[in-house]
């Protein structure tokens, strides 16, 4: 079997050699070959090219399209690292400094309080909160932090929370607070991070992180 | 079970005022938005004035911009309208209700109260 094939195969090599040999000669204008034959041998000639051209043009446009594709669903990701601020609202504030992370323009961070994103979708989001606090210094109320959702056309709402009480240690306890969850969001849609006492919170090396990775 | 109980509606001349109460119970008050609707004698359903879960953001229809004041007491379960310059196109029955979205202009309530009734009449 394996013979046939290759007696196969150099019929094949054969007979195209042969054309191609036939091709030269109506071009070089040889008075052996009938002009019919030429004429009849070129527009077969140029058939298989134009075969060729095609296949290579569908070719590049399936890849240009995988490339499309990529392009449609590039990483969307942020971490940024908390900032100690001197205002006294309950919106942490954050800055893209020290190991942060800011993957493309698709995902910015505004006002250094909110991160914003341009392309619906299901996010993960996340938020490490360390703070200290004392029983004694603090209100009875706990500490609490909340991952907040504000998105065009719409009220700001809450998507998690935590609390945690005061420590006894004295000047202050360390406790660290961790949200993370899975949400759909719109374009334009910005998250922050609300706590009930910004003073409260540790701005050390690690500590206090806010980001999110589109899934 | 959700409730919401409108009262303050009544008979009032064209230039005065009224302050409509809306009391809600068996829902956590304080983490949704809230709305006014009104419905005028044989018209459909009118978007009034929203107000986000805690106080600050408030949006209100161009009819009544200027002249109307959404606000809320989440200490009490209380959401408030308090009506100014009022005119004879403002008599309607006024509804207190609560969305599970979170949009500024309402596009569907899950409960409502039974309405209050506004005539302003000369």
């Known amino acids: 079997h394996r013979r046939l094939d290759k007696i196969e195969d150099e019929r094949n090599l054969h007979e195209d050699f042969v054309f191609m040999k036939t091709i030269q000669r109506c071009n070089t204008g040889e008075r052996s070959l009938s002009l019919l034959n030429c004429e009849e041998i070129k527009s077969q000639f140029e058939g298989f090219v134009k075969d060729i051209m095609l296949n290579k043009e569908e070719t590049k446009k399936e890849n240009s399209f995988e490339m499309q594709k990529g392009d449609q669903n590039p990483q969307i990701a942020a971490h940024v690292i908390s900032e100690a601020s001197s205002k006294t609202t309950s919106v942490l504030q954050w800055a893209e400094k020290g190991y942060y992370t800011m993957s493309n323009n698709l995902v910015t961070l505004e006002n250094g309080k909110q991160l914003t994103v341009k392309r619906q979708g299901l996010y993960y989001i996340y938020a490490q909160v360390t703070f200290c606090s004392n029983r004694e210094a603090s209100s009875q109320a706990p500490f609490i932090a909340s991952l907040c959702l504000k998105s065009p056309g719409r009220f700001e709402r809450i998507l998690l929370r935590a609390a945690n009480t005061h420590s006894s240690a004295k000047p202050c306890g360390q406790q660290s607070i961790h949200l993370g969850g899975v949400f759909e969001l719109q374009p334009g849609a910005s998250v922050f991070v609300n706590v009930t006492d910004p003073s409260q919170v540790s701005h050390g090396t690690g500590f206090t992180s806010f980001g999110l990775l589109k899934l | 079970e959700v409730q919401l109980l409108e009262s303050g509606g009544g008979l009032v001349q064209p230039g005065g005022s009224l302050r409509l109460s809306c009391a809600a119970s068996?829902?956590?008050?304080?983490?949704?938005?809230m709305y006014w609707v009104r419905q005028a004698p044989g018209k459909g359903l009118e978007w009034v004035s929203s107000?986000?879960?805690?106080?600050?953001?408030?949006y209100y229809a161009d009819s009544v911009k200027g002249r109307f004041t959404i606000s809320r007491d989440n200490s009490k379960n209380t959401l408030y309208l308090q009506m100014n310059s009022l005119r004879a196109e403002d008599t309607a029955v006024y509804y207190c209700?609560?969305?599970?979205?979170?949009?500024?202009?309402?596009?569907?309530?899950?409960?409502w109260g039974q309405g209050t009734l506004v005539t302003v009449s000369s």
């Open positions: 107000i986000g879960p805690s106080g600050p953001n408030t």
């Open positions: 068996g829902f956590t008050f304080d983490e949704y938005p």
């Open positions: 209700a609560k969305s599970p979205y979170f949009d500024v202009i309402p596009s569907y309530f899950d409960y």
